[in-house]
């Protein structure tokens, strides 16, 4: 039977999505106990039937990976959680409409920072996602977001930064002082979806200039 207030057993049912890995999470309510079990269903926009997620039925953990089930980039999804307490009380709550394109956040890019004597090179590695193309290969963020670009910044001192940006993967900051430490930050930007990743940061030191020794 339904509790007087579903929030007594179940709260904050939501998708947490990063780089298209879509995890359903929730919290127990004030009357939830460690032996409360949770069952997860999902569906697409406008469909009547909820589909039970295998591996997430009568579980006690408070998360469920729905990445595979929510992998269509143009689809809208919902998920819902039914909590059943040891005493047989139950509560069901559903997520808001979920679009992975709209709602996923971007992790910092994977970058290799290479020190040289008077320059620092930064190589951005393509970011894989769980999304698969028709032929089965995994798409990168660059495949999904056609307007994706990288924004790179090199902190030279407290008052001066150098900036580079573009769609290419390799960048180099020139004209630097040898044997000096710099802080580099690299972000992914997707203007059409107003997305900006957290920065990847590398602290690098230019090589000493050996030509005078």
């Amino acid at each position: 039977h339904a509790p007087e207030d579903p929030s007594d057993l179940l709260q904050h049912v939501k998708f947490q999505s990063s780089n298209f890995e879509n995890i359903l999470t929730w919290d127990s309510g004030p009357e939830g106990t460690p032996d409360t079990v949770y069952s997860i269903e999902y569906k697409t926009y406008g469909e009547r039937d909820w589909v039970a997620k295998k591996g997430c039925q009568r579980i006690t953990r408070k998360s469920c990976n729905l990445t595979v089930e929510t992998g269509n980039l143009t689809e809208l999804y919902y998920a819902r959680v039914t909590a059943v307490s040891a005493g047989g009380r139950s509560a069901t709550k559903m997520t808001d409409r979920f679009s992975s394109l709209q709602h996923t956040t971007l992790k910092p890019p994977d970058v290799t920072c290479i020190s040289k004597v008077r320059s620092i090179q930064m190589i951005v590695h393509p970011t894989p996602t769980p999304i698969r193309a028709g032929d089965g290969h995994r798409l990168t963020l660059e495949d999904i977001f056609h307007d994706l670009f990288y924004h790179l910044e090199l902190q030279v001192n407290r008052t001066y930064q150098m900036h580079l940006g573009g769609k290419q993967r390799e960048y180099e900051f020139f004209g630097l002082t040898p044997d000096t430490e710099f802080l580099g930050t690299i972000m992914i930007c997707v203007p059409t979806w107003a997305k900006e990743s957290a920065p990847y940061m590398c602290r690098v030191k230019t090589l000493p200039d050996r030509t005078w020794t």
């Epitope: 579903p6 926009y45 406008g46 709550k93 559903m94």
Partner: antibody, heavy 116, light 113 residues
């Protein structure tokens, strides 16, 4: 059996407010979206907005955004429509209707008459 | 907003004859994710709330007689009552759920000739 029962209609003065209730039974309100639709006498159907009762997230028809507020009380399994600054043209039967796209269950409606 | 326009506004059909109602949307209702159209049809009898007949343009709601069928794609849709019965006298509405705000056609009144 799913049932939606609206209440709270009646005669309201122009410039006044109304608060309509939609009591759900036969299912948990938090298991689906709830919509409000109105129908002026002898006229067509007009969507006011929707609420996700689990989260309280709302989407309104821009026409009503400034005057309508959708809320729920999960413990009462009841959804509410509050409308302010009422005028004669708000005279209508107000329905609550379930689901997120089209509407599979409707209440019987409650008549609101705005008149002095 | 998507404008839904129904035609005719009313029609009179003999018992047992076919009734056809058209609904035109101001933009395509084709939902790319499932290649279905975001269109529903409702029946409303006097003093009653609307009743869902058809969703996704052509899927019949459970319990709805099979004389009711929906067809069409993109911007042009049709509700057909293959053999009109006395209990089918009502106003019929189409509704789009492709984008906010959800909008309805102005309604078509079906009567017996």
């Amino acid at each position: 059996e799913v049932q939606l029962v609206e209440s709270g209609g009646g005669l309201v003065q122009p410039g006044g407010s109304l608060r309509l209730s939609c009591a759900a039974s036969g299912y948990s309100l938090t298991a689906d979206y709830m919509n409000w639709v109105r129908q002026a006498p002898g006229k067509g159907l007009e969507w006011i907005g929707e609420i996700n009762p689990s989260t309280g997230t709302t989407t309104y028809n821009q026409k009503f955004e400034a005057r309508a507020t959708l809320t729920v009380d999960q413990s009462k399994n009841t959804a509410y429509l509050q409308m302010n600054s009422l005028r004669a043209e708000d005279t209508a039967v107000y329905y609550c209707a379930r689901f997120d796209a089209y509407f599979d269950y409707w209440g019987q409606g409650t008549l609101v008459t705005v008149s002095s | 907003d998507i404008v839904m326009t129904q035609s005719p506004d009313s029609l009179a059909v003999s018992l047992g004859e076919r009734a056809t109602i058209n609904c035109k949307s101001s933009q395509s209702l084709l939902y790319s994710s499932n290649q279905k159209n975001c269109l529903a049809w409702y029946q409303q009898k006097p003093g009653q709330p609307p009743k869902l007949l058809i969703y996704w343009a052509s899927s019949r709601e459970s319990g709805v007689p099979d004389r009711f069928s929906g067809s069409g794609s993109g911007t042009d849709f049709t509700l057909t009552i293959s053999s009109l019965q006395a209990e089918d006298v009502a106003v019929y509405y189409c509704q789009q759920y492709f984008s906010y705000p959800f909008t309805f056609g102005q309604g078509t009144k079906v009567e017996i000739k």
